[in-house]
């Protein structure tokens, strides 16, 4: 069966979120990874959507994160703007209303999504052969 | 394959004006920024202007404010520059550059050359 | 607008040195540095952004420090293709600026 084309886009947005950090990027995420030997697929990719759901949510008007030039600014709306994006495909992917996030375990954003990255990297490669 | 191709520069006479295209590839055009870098010959690198593709809204550095203008056709992944009222000293080649998602400028085109002489 | 200053103007050194590439801005600029090298003939390319962070493909001996108004850009074995004009570039504020260049030269 073909690769759905929501996989391709969140490949894709997860290839340029991972291209470069940022300061908030440095920030904690529940860490969703630590431990989800016995989640479905798709309840995986909603956990996530949550975790990405929460992070912008809380930091989108971070002082912290939007720094103090109109660069700063530009580039943590661009980290906003992305994940908006990887949180609205994700859902897609999931096709769940709703999922809990009660890890108590935490990672940098930075590293969710690279661990993120190899787990879409996987589905693609599993469904494209 | 992202890929920046520059294309508009040649001689030109002092006061003249000469608009360059820059055509972008392999990436989605309005994720990242646009920038217009100069490299006089034989000199270093001078920033001319970056432009928010999303939003259209640009930055020019004073050199270059009211006679350089900047523009976008989102529909051809296209970046423009309009030069005008154009010197000898603006001699140069003329770069087009990806901004990187969020630092820095990580794609570059080949560049150029407007030469500006009588 | 931000200037910035690179030192020294050229570097003459052999393969296999420790090239150190400094760069000062004339006020702070926090993190939101960067390095790009320039081959004759070539266009610029990345290295080093949010002063010490490599970018894509940019091998290990690439190194990047500093903070604040002191940049340092750092090959720790010169390999044959290094050789080259390296810039400094701040992304703090616009006007975006560059240094002026350090060519590392082949002694």
């Known amino acids: 069966h073909k690769c759905d084309i929501t996989l391709q886009e969140i490949i894709k947005t997860l290839n340029s979120l991972t291209e470069q950090k940022t300061l908030c990027t440095e920030l904690t995420v529940t860490d969703i990874f630590a431990a989800s030997k016995n989640t479905t697929e798709k309840e995986t990719f909603c956990r996530a959507a949550t975790v990405l759901r929460q992070f912008y949510s809380h930091h989108e008007k971070d002082t912290r994160c939007l720094g103090a030039t109109a660069q700063q600014f530009h580039r943590h709306k661009q980290l906003i703007r992305f994940l908006k994006r990887l949180d609205r495909n994700l859902w897609g992917l999931a096709g769940l209303n709703s999922c809990p996030v009660k890890e108590a375990n935490q990672s940098t954003l930075e590293n969710f999504l690279e661990r993120l990255k190899t787990i879409m990297r996987e589905k693609y490669s599993k469904c494209s052969s | 394959e992202v890929q920046l191709v520059e294309s508009g520069g040649g001689l030109v006479q002092p006061g003249g004006s000469l608009r360059l295209s820059c055509a972008a590839s392999g990436y989605t055009f309005t994720d990242y920024s646009m920038h217009w870098v100069r490299q006089a010959p034989g000199k270093g690198l001078e920033w001319v202007v970056w432009?928010?593709?999303?939003?259209?809204?640009?930055t020019y550095a004073d050199d270059f404010k009211g006679r350089f203008t900047i523009s976008l056709d989102n529909s051809k992944n296209t970046a423009y520059l309009q030069m005008n009222s154009l010197r000898a000293e603006d001699t140069a080649v003329y770069y087009c550059?990806?901004?990187?998602?969020?630092?820095?400028?990580?794609?570059w085109g080949q560049g150029t050359l407007v030469t500006v002489s009588s | 607008e931000i200037v910035l200053t690179q030192s020294p103007a050229t570097l003459s050194l052999s393969p296999g040195e420790r090239a150190t590439l400094s760069c000062k801005a004339s006020q702070s600029v926090i993190n939101d540095a960067a390095w790009y090298q320039q081959k004759p003939g070539q266009a610029p390319r990345l290295l080093i952004y949010y002063t010490s962070h490599r970018y894509t493909g940019i091998p290990a001996r690439f190194s990047g420090s500093g903070s604040g108004t002191d940049f340092t850009l750092t090959i720790s074995s010169l390999e044959p293709e290094d050789f080259a004009v390296y810039y400094c570039q701040q992304d703090y504020t616009s006007p975006w600026t560059f240094g002026q260049g350090t060519k590392v030269e082949i002694k």
């Open positions: 432009i928010n593709t999303e939003t259209g809204e640009p």
């Open positions: 550059a990806r901004g990187g998602i969020f630092y820095g400028m990580d794609y």
